[in-house]
Interface confidence: medium
């Protein structure tokens, strides 16, 4: 709305950079072929670029990431009863950003 | 995968908090009856609750809120020329969080 | 105070019955798995019972699968272990103790124990 | 049924570093607890999910597990660390507990 303009602050700008975001670890990345299973713990911290950029042409994107092995439970349901086991996800921490210039495929003449 | 055990440390729930995540400022939260103009910035910083609970039957929820009025250039197109204008945009900032009982419905017998 | 207090225990012969009650206070009990461990005089800890955080999940250490039952009733806060058909072998101190988590995991708070004695 | 072994007992000087073992088949594909049992009391947990600690539980605990071999150690051992020590792993269906290492301050 345009009112109440005097109680408002300026907006500030969400600038392209890392920020910690939560991760939910779906049973797939653990196993495709078996779904009688939970995953412990369901979500963890990632650190991912977000935020925008100075102008409409650009993006904001991860410019260095890292992959994370991280150890979780599979618990396998057995007749009723559970099975615990590890596994490991990996997850993608982004590490630096930078504000990239989208390029669009021309259409071919 | 089961396998690369040793690296990997413990994966950490993450947990039911406020964190800041990036809100895009869309145009129709300005006015709805015109699609002919810019909003700067295009998105904002605000606090959000997020993460996951200990229990299966709770959810990570808002317990606490605030409105934040912020202002937002509108950059309306009028004859291939901008013309700057002021409007406002109310944010909602989580303040605090809880884990709530999911209530499912029970089916009217 | 974060605490479990268990208390039914006692000298009962070869043959009998006893109830175990563990009462919980100072946390959503209802959001935590639960499990008995006992000790023999003089032994080392042994897993006897697990009940998950709904009461749904239930299981059995060997010895005991046939003659004990494992049950909860979260709107008193009160996990039970009801003893049928006892032996001399089952004399221990008896702990209920927390999951931290709906599905088990490590016993992150114990009671102080109570003593059930099988004895002619 | 799976079974976890500890050896009986350590011992280890005030300052030095306790190690105590806790052995089973495939034991690394499971996440070990160690618990702290003091005379006439009940047990701590003093390690979980293989290295992690508890707060309120010292830094000079510390745990490890890989292989067929879980190993609680204690750096810069103290008096007040005399006590039974017992491992514990949920594996098929039950939760298992090792037959305890007594531990012994010289």
């Known amino acids: 709305s345009l009112g109440s303009l005097a109680a408002a602050e300026p907006a500030v700008i969400a600038e392209c950079k890392t920020r910690t975001e939560v991760f939910q670890i779906s049973r797939n990345l653990i196993d495709r072929t078996n779904a009688n299973f939970l995953v412990w713990p369901p979500c963890v911290e990632v650190q991912r670029c977000s935020g925008c950029c100075n102008n409409r042409n650009v993006q904001c994107r991860a410019s260095q990431v890292q992959m994370r092995p991280v150890q979780v439970r599979k618990i396998e349901i057995v007749r009723k009863k559970p099975i615990f086991k590890k596994a490991t996800v990996t997850l993608e921490d982004h590490l630096a950003c930078k504000c990239e210039t989208i390029v669009t495929p021309r259409p071919v003449t | 995968s089961l396998g690369s055990l040793a690296a990997a440390e413990p994966a950490v729930i993450a947990e039911c908090k406020t964190r800041t995540e990036v809100f895009q400022i869309s145009r129709n939260l300005i006015d709805r009856t015109n699609a002919n103009f810019l909003v700067w910035p295009p998105c904002v910083e605000v606090q959000r609750c997020s993460g996951c609970c200990n229990n299966r039957n709770v959810q990570c929820r808002a317990s606490q809120v605030q409105m934040r009025p912020v202002q937002v250039r509108k950059i309306e197109i009028v004859r291939k020329k901008p013309i700057f204008k002021k409007a406002t945009v109310t944010l909602e900032d989580h303040l605090a969080c809880k884990c709530e009982t999911i209530v499912t419905p029970r089916p009217v017998t | 105070e974060v605490q479990l207090v268990e208390s039914g225990g006692g000298l009962v012969q070869p043959g009998g019955s006893l109830r175990l009650s563990c009462a919980a206070s100072g946390f959503t009990f209802s959001s935590y798995a639960m499990s008995w461990v006992r000790q023999a005089p003089g032994k080392g800890l042994e897993w006897v019972s697990y009940i998950s955080d709904d009461g749904s999940l239930k299981y059995y250490a060997d010895s005991v699968k046939g003659r004990f039952t494992i049950s909860r009733d979260n709107s008193k806060n009160t996990l039970y272990l009801q003893m049928n058909s006892l032996r001399a072998e089952d004399t221990a101190v008896y702990y209920c103790?927390?999951?931290?988590?709906?599905?088990?995991?490590?016993?992150?708070?114990w009671g102080q124990g109570t003593l059930v004695t099988v004895s002619s | 049924s799976y079974e976890l072994t500890q050896p009986p007992s350590v011992s280890v000087a005030p300052g030095q570093t306790a190690r105590i073992s806790c052995s089973g088949d495939?034991?690394?594909?499971?996440?070990v607890h160690w618990y702290q049992q003091k005379p006439g009391q009940a047990p701590v947990l003093v390690i979980y999910d293989d290295s992690n600690r508890p707060s309120g539980i010292p830094e000079r605990f510390s745990g490890s597990n890989s292989g067929n071999t879980a190993t609680l150690t204690i750096s810069g051992t103290q008096a007040e660390d005399e006590a039974d020590y017992y491992c514990s792993a949920f594996t098929h269906n039950s939760d298992v507990f090792g037959g305890g290492t007594k531990l012994t301050v010289l």
């Open positions: 495939s034991l690394g594909s499971y996440f």
């Open positions: 103790a927390r999951h931290p988590y709906w599905y088990g995991g490590q016993l992150d708070l």
